[in-house]
């Protein structure tokens, strides 16, 4: 009686269970009676990464420079390549199709987390004690003058974007 | 039956052309690369080309016979073609179309063409 | 373009010799396995022998043996018989963008 089920790593086809093609491989001929499925390397451009029944090998995917993408790890007969952003830039979807620049953080806020080529800038504000006054996707929040350590007193209070402002101390005459 | 039948060999003369039919049964059309091979009288065997599974079709050709032969199929009439054009003394051969692409694990019994003025 | 060269291009044995016909490729076939022996008497289709250079389909009997890898294959029949006698082909296929298959010229097995 003919198979109605076949086993992992096969397919049904004329009622009799055909071996799956390995991965890197794709389906030339099916399996006969007589003889195992035929299955041929996928050429060097092209990947397959399961087991499979496909006539076709899927293209590697092209890390496009002019959207300011490049390659990560090539890919292989049995892995898609995998394109990352130049310097400066991250991707803008999981699956990185284009590249945009990173964020800066505005005063008043400073970086959390630097950038990637997956991910963007993340922004904190600054903490009371913590001042930032410029735009940048490197610098962290950075800590207030002390004014006591300099034997100095603070003459205007610091702010998120501003370091406090330290002066002489008044002497008594 | 698993088989493969061609037809439309015949006498022809040079510079025409010819059609030649292979019509499967027995299996998933579809999903089978299909090829033809030639075989002039009294010599060896001689790949003229193949056409791959898959709805685009992809198609490989000896290099003598790339410009001249075509390799098409048609799924709904699971039927494979060779149009043969500009033909020479030299294709005279009996022509089998055969399952599979780089072993072959089905053949016609073959259709003669003699290409002769 | 691949090209096979096959040898001896005919030879006479006995039945019950042993008899190995080589099978030399220009190039490496694909994946190193891609070479099919087949067997053609006169009047008739051939007929698929090995494959994956070693791989007998079922029914093919167990006399008949494929070794090689790359450029170099061999075809032995161990104990030869009388239905035995017919040209054999080797056919490499090197890939699916430069001129997929060749045969060889053939060896034809003759009674001695």
């Known amino acids: 009686e003919p198979p109605t089920a076949c086993r992992e790593k096969q397919y049904l086809i004329n009622s009799q269970c055909c071996s799956l093609c390995q991965p890197g491989q794709k389906l030339v001929s099916d399996c006969t009676e007589f003889t195992e499925t035929e299955c041929l390397p996928c050429s060097e451009s092209e990947f397959l990464d399961t087991w499979n029944r496909e006539t076709r090998c899927h293209q590697h995917k092209y890390c496009d420079p002019n959207l300011g993408l490049q390659v990560q790890q090539k890919g292989t007969s049995e892995t898609d390549t995998i394109c990352t952003c130049e310097e400066g830039l991250h991707c803008t979807s999981e699956s990185c199709e284009s590249c945009v620049p990173h964020r800066s953080c505005l005063p008043g806020f400073g970086v959390k987390q630097i950038a990637t080529g997956v991910s963007d800038t993340i922004c904190e504000p600054c903490p009371v004690g913590f001042f930032s006054n410029v735009s940048s996707a490197f610098e962290k929040c950075r800590p207030w003058t002390s004014c006591e350590t300099k034997d100095l007193v603070v003459q205007q209070a610091g702010t998120n974007k501003t370091d406090v402002v330290c002066g002489p101390q008044d002497r008594q005459r | 039956e698993v088989q493969l039948e061609e037809s439309g060999g015949g006498l022809v003369q040079p510079g025409g052309s010819l059609r030649l039919s292979c019509a499967a049964s027995g299996f998933d059309f579809s999903s089978n690369a299909m090829s033809w091979v030639r075989q002039a009288p009294g010599k060896g065997l001689e790949w003229v080309g193949t056409i791959y599974a898959g709805s685009n079709g992809n198609t490989d050709y000896a290099s003598w016979a790339k410009g001249r032969f075509t390799i098409s199929k048609d799924t709904s009439k699971t039927t494979l073609y060779l149009q043969m054009n500009s033909l020479r003394a030299e294709d005279t051969a009996t022509y089998f179309c055969?399952?599979?692409?780089?072993?072959?694990?089905?053949w016609g019994q073959g259709t003669l063409v003699t290409v002769s003025s | 373009d691949i090209v096979m060269t096959q040898s001896p291009s005919s030879l006479s044995a006995s039945v019950g010799d042993r008899v190995t016909i080589t099978c030399q490729a220009s190039e490496s076939v694909v994946s190193n396995n891609r070479l099919a022996w087949y067997q053609q008497k006169p009047g008739q289709a051939p007929k698929l022998l090995i494959y994956l250079a070693s791989t007998l389909p079922s029914g093919v009997p167990s006399r008949f043996s494929g070794s090689g890898s790359g450029t170099d294959f061999t075809l032995t029949i161990s104990s030869l018989q009388p239905e035995d006698f017919a040209t054999y082909y080797c056919a490499g296929y090197k890939s699916s963008s430069t001129d997929g298959t060749a045969f060889g010229q053939g060896t034809k097995v003759v009674i001695k």
């Open positions: 055969a399952r599979g692409a780089s072993y072959f694990t089905l």
